[in-house]
Amino acid sequence: QEEDLPRPSISAEPGTVIPLGSHVTFVCRGPVGVQTFRLERESRSTYNDTEDVSQASPSESEARFRIDSVSEGNAGPYRCIYYKPPKWSEQSDYLELLVKETSGGPDSPDTEPGSSAGPTQRPSDNSHNEHAPASQGLKAEHLY
């Protein structure tokens, strides 16, 4: 009998409000044994896959998707889904990335720390991305 897969969580480091030109890393978490994590965007057809999965704790695995230099085009809702053979999980809730112009420079510490979406934030809107596919093992230095 197939196990019931828990929904993934998604968070952003250093936060969800990122100055233009700064970096952000999306962290997707799921159970141990995940083979592939996928990061999707609401109403966008693009996605990123990675098989670079590390163990975050005895019961959790994670993958990190980094955007080196955030632009206005990177703003919007993101969500994670993972593949643990032989099936995919449900999608996480969406996490909204906000990109703001800043006069403080790229190292300005005015991001919101610890932002994440577990099963309590905005519900997944299944109207667009249920049918996504995947690219292999992309490092997120060059996301989108």
Epitope: Y47, P85, E130, H131
Partner: antibody, heavy 116, light 111 residues
């Protein structure tokens, strides 16, 4: 990397027919597969799709007339009770890496003829 | 149901000329959009997706633009080999309306 359709043949109206899309050289679990058909001399017509995450979609005209299912290496299109209007070349296609919107990998097609 | 309206149905242009094909979606479809080229007896070939990214191996004479509900394919410096039928497709609708739909096609004749 390729996809190939099989199962197309001549059948009489009302005879169930199953077409199979077989994936080679890539892991099917990561991809959406769509089925498209083209009647002789006509345009492309979307039938439906099987998504990487296990969802299945159908064009409104195809609901109840076809069933799409997948295994780890194939995606099947079952025509439950075909009519002469279903005579066409049937294609399956896989989307491009990193973007769900474009289907870059197409099979050569398989010809289905429904005739009494 | 999502409907893609493609115009014109046929267009003729001389070698070296420019052809513009338009596609209108009945609802906003985000970036879930692509253009395909098909020649008689062949499978469709992906040209543009997302909706302005050039597919691998496609020359930059082909350009896609648009967003929301209005999309355009422009073929410049037309070559004889460009004679084909071109289709637009969206595959980003919702569960209730079916997420795949093709335009009716545009036959491009090169003189």
């Amino acid at each position: 990397q390729s996809v190939k359709e099989s199962g197309g043949r001549l059948v009489t109206p009302g005879t169930p027919l199953t077409l199979t899309c077989t994936a080679s050289g890539f892991s099917l679990y990561k991809y959406n597969i769509q089925w498209v058909r083209q009647a002789p001399g006509k345009g492309l017509e979307y039938i439906g799709a099987s998504t990487y995450a296990g969802y299945t979609y159908y064009a409104s005209w195809a609901k109840g007339r076809v069933t799409i299912s997948r295994t780890s290496t194939t995606v099947d299109l079952k025509m439950t009770s075909p009519t002469t209007e279903d005579t066409a070349t049937y294609f399956c296609a896989r989307h491009i890496d990193g973007d769900y919107s474009g289907y870059a990998l197409w099979g050569p097609g398989t010809l289905v003829t429904i005739s009494s | 149901e999502l409907v893609m309206t493609q115009t014109p149905a046929s267009v003729s242009a001389a070698v070296g000329g420019t052809v513009t094909i338009k596609c209108q979606a009945s609802q906003s479809i985000g970036t879930w959009f692509a253009w395909y080229q098909q020649k008689p007896g062949q499978s469709p070939k992906l040209l543009i997706y997302g909706p302005s990214k050039l597919a691998s191996g496609v020359p930059p004479r082909f350009k896609g633009s648009g967003s929301g509900t209005e999309f355009t394919l422009t073929i410049s410096d037309l070559e004889c080999d460009d004679a084909a039928t071109y289709y637009c497709q969206s595959n980003g609708g919702s569960i209730s309306n079916g997420w795949g739909s093709f335009g009716g096609g545009t036959e491009v004749v090169v003189k």
